[in-house]
Amino acid sequence: PGPPPGSPRASPDPRAELDSTVLLTRSLLEDTRQLTIQLKDKFPADGDHNLDSLPTLAMSAGALGALQLPSVLTRLRADLLSYLRHVQWLRRAMGSSLKTLEPELGTLQTRLDRLLRRLQLLMSRLALPQLPPDPPAPPLAPPSSTWGGIRAAHAILGGLHLTLDWAVRGLLLLKTRL
């Protein structure tokens, strides 16, 4: 009787998925860069700012070569999820003070959420270990003052920019291994 009928290609394969994930990450990187410029223009930073609750940078670009696909995707998802929470927190806690950064901050949050979903789907298609997309996390304390919130905004956008830059390099490298 011959082989059974096949299925038409219904959805993008993981390599195409990785391509579109890189494009989305690049676009988010540009959004973050523009938002950082806006923030510095409206609220100039006096040096570098840190926030203890932010993740430490996953890896230097030079050390990427030794990384494996599962560890890169797992770490990237965990870090981006933390940044998503921080952006949500920033918008809630600093709504009135940072209203000049809306709707850009809202767009950033939406795209970050979309990137996280894309990474989740990619990990599922590859059958890599799954992490809960919405793990419980301790609530972030409100900023002590308006200026404290602005310093936090500088730290969040600066850290997110570095993480996304690392992500683009990492994802491009991993594409060659898939």
Epitope: G6, S7, R9, A10, S11, D13, P14, R15, L69, P70, R117, Q120, L121, S124, R125, L126, A127, L128, P129, Q130, P132, P133, D134, P135, L178
Partner: antibody, heavy 114, light 112 residues
């Protein structure tokens, strides 16, 4: 066109063994995690096992843990399921599936009976 | 018993809209994992209908849509047709099982 073709099913006695194969074509097999899912006659779908795109991660349903082994050969575009210590309750159509799963084969019937 | 709960049956007349629910828990849908839906026509293999809660694979008509909220998800079929008569299954990853879980399936009957 994506094609997944299972083989190796048949009638086997309780306690016996079978090895199922699934030949893949029409897509980049080595880029997809692969699953085995089964369906007992007249029943719903039950996930059996999954193996990551490169074979480094393998997970099993509790009902088959220690008895079934999933493996793959990316150079041959083939997925395998080694089934040992078979029981009557393992009787089902066994499907291989790729990705989420996005694509499914037509299935192969495994009957465990004395 | 399935980890994801679906009504065993659903029905509607041609042209109608029907909805099939899928209820999970904090270890699967409630943990934020995506829900996927499959259609199994009589005597055939399952086919992916909706992935990632609300994404349609190419070739699937826009009469089919999915949504998710909290620990539940639902599949909606509008403009019901006789060829939609099939079994429908939801699926999601489950932390406690370290693998995907399926709902028990819903048999959709198109009346008349």
């Amino acid at each position: 066109e994506v094609q997944l073709l299972e083989s190796g099913g048949g009638l086997v006695q309780p306690g016996g063994s079978l090895r199922l194969s699934c030949a893949a074509s029409g897509f980049t097999f080595s880029s997809y995690g692969m699953h085995w899912v089964r369906q007992a006659p007249g029943k719903g779908l039950e996930w059996v096992s999954v193996i990551s795109y490169d074979g480094s991660y393998k997970y099993y349903a509790d009902s088959v843990k220690g008895r079934f082994t999933i493996s793959r050969d990316n150079s041959k575009n083939t997925l395998y399921l080694q089934m040992n210590s078979l029981r009557a309750e393992d009787t089902a159509v066994y499907y291989c599936a790729a990705g989420v799963p996005d694509y499914w084969g037509q299935g192969t019937l495994v009957t465990v009976s004395s | 018993q399935s980890v994801l709960t679906q009504p065993p049956s659903a029905s509607g007349t041609p042209g109608q809209r029907v909805t099939i629910s899928c209820t999970g828990s904090s270890s699967n849908i409630g943990a934020g994992y995506d829900v996927h839906w499959y259609q199994q026509l009589p005597g055939t293999a399952p086919k992916l209908l909706i992935y990632s809660n609300n994404e349609r694979p190419s070739g699937v008509p826009d009469r089919f849509s999915g949504s998710k909220s909290g620990t539940s998800a639902s599949l909606a079929i509008s403009g019901l047709r006789s060829e939609d008569e099939a079994d429908y299954y939801c699926a999601a990853w489950d932390d406690s099982l370290n693998g995907p879980v399926f709902g028990g399936g819903t048999k959709l009957t198109v009346l008349g």
